[in-house]
């Protein structure tokens, strides 16, 4: 079946700025028209596309949640970049929300890694040096990193 055989019977209503597809694909920052004849620009700050594509619509921009800071705004070619606020982090296995970092390590453990937007503080057993991955105790006890020096909070 040729494209001529399948010529569309109607044209889509005019929308944003248009250009022509290249080999049936539109460049980043655009989506394709229903009839495949035009590339239509995404709306700045509303939607985006990152790759050459033949999709009928651009992808909706992410809105940063409360508890997140916007590192960079949404453009027509790149989604918003959001990051957890200081003192909170987002884990890979629970990406839907920022969680508060622990303020210290359980008894018998020392802090070896700070709170970052991507990870909680990292604690290891004093003696063995193995990482702690268990739940935080009900009553969190801040332990000393070295004699007389309290473990530092997330920064």
């Amino acid at each position: 079946i040729t494209q001529q055989d399948l010529a569309p019977q109607q044209r889509a209503a005019p929308q944003q700025k248009r250009s022509s597809p290249s080999e049936g694909l539109c460049p980043p920052g655009h989506h394709i028209s229903e009839d495949g004849r035009d590339c239509i620009s995404c709306k700045y700050g509303q939607d985006y596309s990152t790759h050459w594509n033949d999709l009928l619509f651009c992808l909706r921009c992410t809105r940063c949640d409360s508890g997140e800071v916007e590192l960079s705004p949404c453009t027509t070619t790149r989604n918003t970049v959001c990051q957890c606020e200081e003192g909170t982090f987002r884990e890979e296995d629970s990406p839907e929300m920022c969680r508060k970092c622990r303020t210290g390590c359980p008894r018998g453990m020392v802090k070896v890694g700070d709170c970052t937007p991507w990870s909680d503080i990292e604690c290891v057993h004093k003696e063995s040096g193995t990482k702690h991955s268990g739940e935080v105790p009900a009553v969190e006890e801040t332990v000393t990193s070295s004699p007389g020096t309290p473990a530092s909070p997330c920064s």
């Epitope: 569309p8 109607q10 044209r11 889509a12 209503a13 229903e34 495949g36 004849r37 009928l56 619509f57």
Partner: nanobody, 123 residues
Framework: EVQLLESGGGEVQPGGSLRLSCAAS????????MGWFRQAPGKEREFVSA????????YYAESVKGRFTISRDNAKNTVYLQMSSLRAEDTAVYYC????????????????WGQGTLVTVSS
């Protein structure tokens, strides 16, 4: 979850008519196309017709132009294929499918498929 339910298939004599329906649920895309494909025994699945939701752009395969008409009911999320002047070579299982790509007349451009409804044209 996208679900497509075809209906309206059956047996008809040459020159007769049938209307196929495809009801879609679970579609949350800003725009999409719904197409009809058919597959005769021992043959590859082939494009028949497609219609787009926002602009209403329509496509037909050359073999059905002037005999088949595709239409949509936006409120019901349903697409129809009115088939007339049916021929023995129109006998096939007719599938409804959904695409989020433009100018979608190839099978691989469709992401969601119905189970199909059988159309038999026989005297």
């Amino acid at each position: 979850e996208v679900q497509l339910l075809e209906s309206g298939g059956g047996e008809v004599q040459p020159g007769g008519s049938l209307r196929l329906s495809c009801a879609a649920s679970g579609l949350t895309f800003p725009n999409y196309g719904m197409g009809w494909f058919r597959q005769a025994p021992g043959k590859e699945r082939e494009f028949v017709s497609a219609i787009y939701w926002s602009g209403g752009t329509v496509y037909y395969a050359e073999s059905v132009k002037g005999r088949f008409t595709i239409s949509r009911d936006n409120a019901k999320n349903t697409v129809y294929l009115q088939m007339s002047s049916l021929r023995a070579e129109d006998t096939a299982v007719y599938y409804c499918a959904v695409t989020i790509r433009g100018a979608a007349t190839q099978t691989w451009k469709y992401d969601y498929w119905g189970q199909g409804t059988l159309v038999t044209v026989s005297s």
